[in-house]
């Protein structure tokens, strides 16, 4: 399974990555976060490593992305799960895997699901198993909105920069 | 499975496709490549057919996309796999399917995985079988960077313009 | 399949295309539609509810999105399917699930598939089951073109705003 990250020095270099100065001076908020591979039983988003970044006002707060300015954003996320059968008798206990991007806004007193993907895995039938989930879409967001994720099956995540990520960019 | 092409006359018309020039004069590099359906045991990317295109500086070299100018790009790819059981005894030999978008840059002496999706298929259990993988994300890229793909399970690809593709656009 | 890329000369022509004088230079056509949850055995797209929207000239026509101005668009869609086994004997009847984004332009006498994803599910083996499909890519489209979807397995759709959607935005 791919687990190729960048060495610390390479990551440092990547953080100083050149930015395209377009002819017009409009800011283009964008963010790409990766799941911290050192946290095996949680999904902690990081922007200071590998290919991850926060640009033009995006910031991280309580494991959520903070929307820097009102507008339409394309929001996306991916997870990859893997596992083995628990035992020969495991066929009767399906494993529910799900990944969701949620919006928390001052407009609503709850987390609104924006993107949801789900899968039922039967580990006893298929050993080992692997499953990928990806989704993305355009949403009208307001400055200060919080974008977060919720995942069922976190212990089964394949945490690498290319398999588990979360991002957004202004259109 | 979709295999719908365009008639020669329609193809001729489509080649003269109008392009949107916005009020500001900035170029918007974009590319969409499709897997060559005439190459059954390899994945060769093409930009001169069907809905595929290279715009504003993108080019193909050694089956890789060359990044035309430094900046942030959304990079995406999809593959669809299909197959039948090998034999009644095939349940013991799982098939590993994977698709990865990789970056080769002068900064690093190796291919860095940007996007990875994986699946384990058990052909003996499910005959026939079909599986789709998609992924996409935003990355900071440098002029001259090479974007390529690596696929496990190439003989099982469903090669059509709407099922197997690879693209990128500048944000 | 017949070729519809831009030839060098056509690309040259396209670059000389006159600027579209929009009302202001910041128009960014975008649309995000959700499947109407009140229509259980059909997939009816709505833009006037929940997080859905039509912006800067996108419009609906006969359950299709109408392209507001010629240019390159990122087009995407997702569906989630779910189900239970029909009976203990259902293993012999696989369920074909598919979702496709199609382009209809009356220059062709058929719908051209742009994005296709497929899956074969064996309900007798896995009860209950869940499956997600997502795809998206960049396409050169013309003002007035119609983007629609075709789905196999509509009775199995999980119709919610975060699971079944269809959208596009101008690059």
């Amino acid at each position: 399974l791919p687990g190729v990250g960048l060495t610390p020095s390479a990551a440092q270099t990547a953080r100083q990555h050149p930015k395209m100065h377009l002819a017009h001076s409009t800011l283009k908020p964008a963010a790409h976060l990766i799941g911290d591979p050192s946290k095996q039983n949680s999904l902690l988003w990081r922007a200071n490593t590998d290919r991850a970044f926060l640009q033009d006002g995006f910031s991280l707060s309580n494991n959520s992305l903070l929307v820097p300015t009102s507008g339409i954003y394309f929001v996306y996320s991916q997870v990859v799960f893997s596992g083995k059968a628990y035992s020969p008798k495991a066929t009767s206990s399906p494993l529910y895997l799900a990944h969701e991007v949620q919006l928390f806004s001052s407009q609503y007193p709850f987390h609104v699901p924006l993107l949801s993907s789900q899968k039922m895995v039967y580990p006893g039938l298929q050993e080992p198993w692997l499953h990928s989930m990806y989704h993305g879409a355009a949403f009208q967001l307001t400055q200060g909105d919080q974008l977060s994720t919720h995942t069922d099956g976190i212990p089964h995540l394949v945490l690498s920069p290319s398999t588990v990520f979360f991002g957004a960019f202004a259109l | 499975l979709p295999g719908v092409g365009l008639t020669p006359s329609a193809a001729q018309t489509a080649r003269q496709h109008p392009k949107m020039h916005l009020a500001h004069s900035t170029l918007k590099p974009a590319a969409h490549l499709i897997g060559d359906p005439s190459k059954q045991n390899s994945l060769l990317w093409r930009a001169n057919t069907d809905r595929a295109f290279l715009q504003d500086g993108f080019s193909l070299s050694n089956n890789s996309l060359l990044v035309p100018t430094s900046g942030i790009y959304f990079v995406y790819s999809q593959v669809v796999f299909s197959g039948k059981a090998y034999s009644p005894k095939a349940t013991s030999s799982p098939l590993y399917l994977a698709h990865e978008v990789q970056l080769f840059s002068s900064q690093y002496p190796f291919h860095v995985p940007l996007l990875s999706s994986q699946k384990m298929v058990y052909p003996g259990l499910q005959e026939p079988w079909l599986h789709s993988m998609y992924h996409g994300a935003a990355f900071q890229l440098t002029q001259g960077d090479q974007l390529s793909t690596h696929t496990d399970g190439i003989p099982h690809l469903v090669l059509s313009p709407s099922t197997v593709f690879f693209g990128a656009f500048a944000l | 399949l017949p070729g519809v890329g831009l030839t060098p000369s056509a690309a040259q022509t396209a670059r000389q295309h006159p600027k579209m004088h929009l009302a202001h230079s910041t128009l960014k056509p975008a649309a995000h539609l959700i499947g109407d949850p009140s229509k259980q055995n059909s997939l009816l797209w709505r833009a006037n509810t929940d997080r859905a929207f039509l912006q800067d000239g996108f419009s609906l026509s006969n359950n299709s999105l109408l392209v507001p101005t010629s240019g390159i668009y990122f087009v995407y869609s997702q569906v989630v399917f779910s189900g239970k086994a029909y009976s203990p004997k259902a293993t012999s009847s696989p369920l074909y699930l598919a979702h496709e984004v199609q382009l209809f332009s009356s220059q062709y006498p058929f719908h051209v598939p742009l994005l296709s994803s497929q899956k074969m599910v064996y309900p007798g083996l896995q009860e209950p089951w869940l499956h997600s499909m997502y795809h998206g890519a960049a396409f050169q489209l013309t003002q007035g073109d119609q983007l629609s979807t075709h789905t196999d397995g509509i009775p199995h759709l999980v119709l919610s705003p975060s699971t079944v959607f269809f959208g596009a935005f101008a690059l």
Epitope: - | - | M20, P29, N48, S59, P68, S106, T142
Partner: antibody, heavy 118, light 107 residues
Framework: EVQLVESGGGLVQPGGSLRLSCAAS????????IHWVRQAPGKGLEWVGY????????NYNEKFKGRATISSDKSKNTAYLQMNSLRAEDTAVYYC???????????WGQGTLVTVSS | DIQMTQSPSSLSASVGDRVTITCRAS??????VAWYQQKPGKAPKLQIY???HRYTGVPSRFSGSGSGTDFTLTISSLQPEDFATYYC?????????FGQGTKVEIK
């Protein structure tokens, strides 16, 4: 400057046909659709349909499907509206219009009056 | 088809008056509404699109608002050249439909 000039209006017998022309200038003809909109005397506006000269794509108001045909000739920078089986209620000023974004009727011709009467 | 109902059908006002015209859609159309001005014997002119965006060259005294089913065109200070008939149009779904018009006359 964008200019649209309609022609072909006049008196038509009930059951007859008409073919209206819309000559376009001042922009690249194949970059935008041409809409046809009509207005009965003293009444409101009614969208008939559009044609894209680039690819001959069309979209019609269902009310006019089968009776109206919208086409264009790239070589002449001209769009056409053909209407068959005309009735008295088809009496109207017929306008062609060029949008900016598809559903926004930004540029209009001067209109041509069609009178259906015996 | 979506029906667009305008009110009032006509109104009398004086130069300098604030004028408000409303338009109601038979179903929610998001913010997909445009407004046109038409003078006798002339073609309509686009004033407002997407409920609240002024088209190029339209004076700032014209403004639009609303979303869902209820929309408003406001002329903050009526000028002599503003006396005309105004039409709303939904651009949410085809067939794009217009209101029956509101005639703004000199009092």
């Amino acid at each position: 400057e964008v200019q649209l000039v309609e022609s072909g209006g006049g008196l038509v017998q009930p059951g007859g046909s008409l073919r209206l022309s819309c000559a376009a200038s001042g922009y690249t003809f194949t970059s935008y659709v041409i809409h046809w909109v009509r207005q009965a005397p003293g009444k409101g506006l009614e969208w008939v349909g559009y044609n894209n000269p680039y690819n001959d794509g069309t979209n019609y108001n269902e009310k006019f499907k089968g009776r109206a045909t919208i086409s264009s000739d790239k070589s002449k920078n001209t769009a056409y509206l053909q209407m068959n089986s005309l009735r008295a209620e088809d009496t109207a000023v017929y306008y062609c219009s060029r949008p900016t974004m598809l559903p926004w009727f930004a540029y209009w011709g001067q209109g041509t009056l069609v009178t259906v009467s015996s | 088809d979506i029906q667009m109902t305008q009110s009032p059908s006509s109104l009398s006002a004086s130069v300098g008056d604030r004028v408000t015209i409303t338009c109601r859609a038979s179903q929610a159309v998001s913010s997909a509404v445009a407004w046109y001005q038409q003078k006798p014997g002339k073609a309509p002119k686009l004033q407002i699109y997407s409920a609240s965006h002024r088209y190029t060259g339209v004076p700032s005294r014209f403004s639009g608002s609303g979303s869902g089913t209820d929309f408003t065109l406001t002329i903050s200070s009526l000028q002599p050249e503003d006396f005309a008939t105004y039409y709303c149009q939904e651009h949410y779904s085809t067939p794009w439909t217009f209101g029956q018009g509101t005639k703004v006359e000199i009092k």
